[in-house]
């Protein structure tokens, strides 16, 4: 088992909104849970976009999940990752 590296980034989306993206890379096996939490509970699936789990060329895998949020509300959101029985949460950078 190889644990993922998780990285959260933000980018401007439209006026007053930003897109936050949570990327997991370098993990094996390919099964992974990656999702956003808002106010400590699950964010509805229809407001999240998931990338495919793809090989990254090193025998490991990568994927991502993104959502659009209001600028200034970053503190309400965390990315949750679970892989091979281990899990972690990752805040949006200020």
């Amino acid at each position: 088992t190889v644990p993922p590296m998780v990285n959260v980034t933000r980018s401007e989306a439209s006026e007053g909104n930003i897109t936050v993206t949570c990327r997991a890379s370098g993990f094996y096996p390919w099964n992974i849970t990656l999702s956003w939490r808002q106010d400590g509970v699950s964010l509805s699936h229809d407001t999240q976009q998931w990338g495919d789990v793809l090989p990254d060329g090193n025998g490991t895998y990568q994927t991502w999940v993104a959502t659009r949020i209001c600028q200034g509300e970053e503190q309400r959101f965390t990315c949750y990752m679970e892989h091979s029985g281990n899990h972690s949460t990752h805040p949006v950078p200020s």
Epitope: T33, D39, G40, V41, S42, E73, Q75, R76, E82, H87
Partner: antibody
Amino acid sequence: DVQLQGSGPGLVKPSQSLSLTCSVTGYSITNDYYWNWIRQFPGNKLEWMGFISFGGSNNYNPSLKNRISITRDTSKNQFFLKLSSVTTEDTATYYCARYDGRGAWFAYWAQGTLVTVSA
Amino acid sequence: DIQMTQSPASLSASVGETVTITCRASGNIHNYLAWYQQKQGKSPQLLVYDAITLADGVPSRFSGSGSGTQYSLKINSLQPEDFGNYYCQHFWSFPLTFGAGTKVEIK
């Protein structure tokens, strides 16, 4: 270390409003986290009532309809519960508690305040 | 709303025994589950979150497991201080709800 302390009257008459205070020490309620009220009925059933967040937003249990209000006084580092039009069914031990944005589990609780609704 | 059904409602066990408490959710809660212990006259104390993670200071004889709608709390080698009520709580969505509790008595 953060500490929460609940306080308020132990006896409220039916149809009146129940008002409780949670005083927080060791952490500013505007910095982060979600500041909640939870109650436990006789018989031990637990019910989440709602929260006020670090940013001042609220989320309430729909079962309490329009009877609940959670507010705060940032200068005193306190948050408050107001429950209107109480009945004997609102007799319970009331707890204030905190969770963080990683997940809505309650790592910090105040001691309970028993509130009896009776004429 | 997601309903949480706990079983058994009560149990009695001897010191050193292993006991298991189960919690069933009315929908898939994807491991968004916490367990608490409450002793008479005290506030609940967090034991487990995210279904499997022990909270700080919780003895390793406690363990959480499960997925989907079915979750368990296991106490290995029950100790006298483990008596009390145990509750599960989901945090998949609002409103947050708790199980009705399991009373653990020491024989």
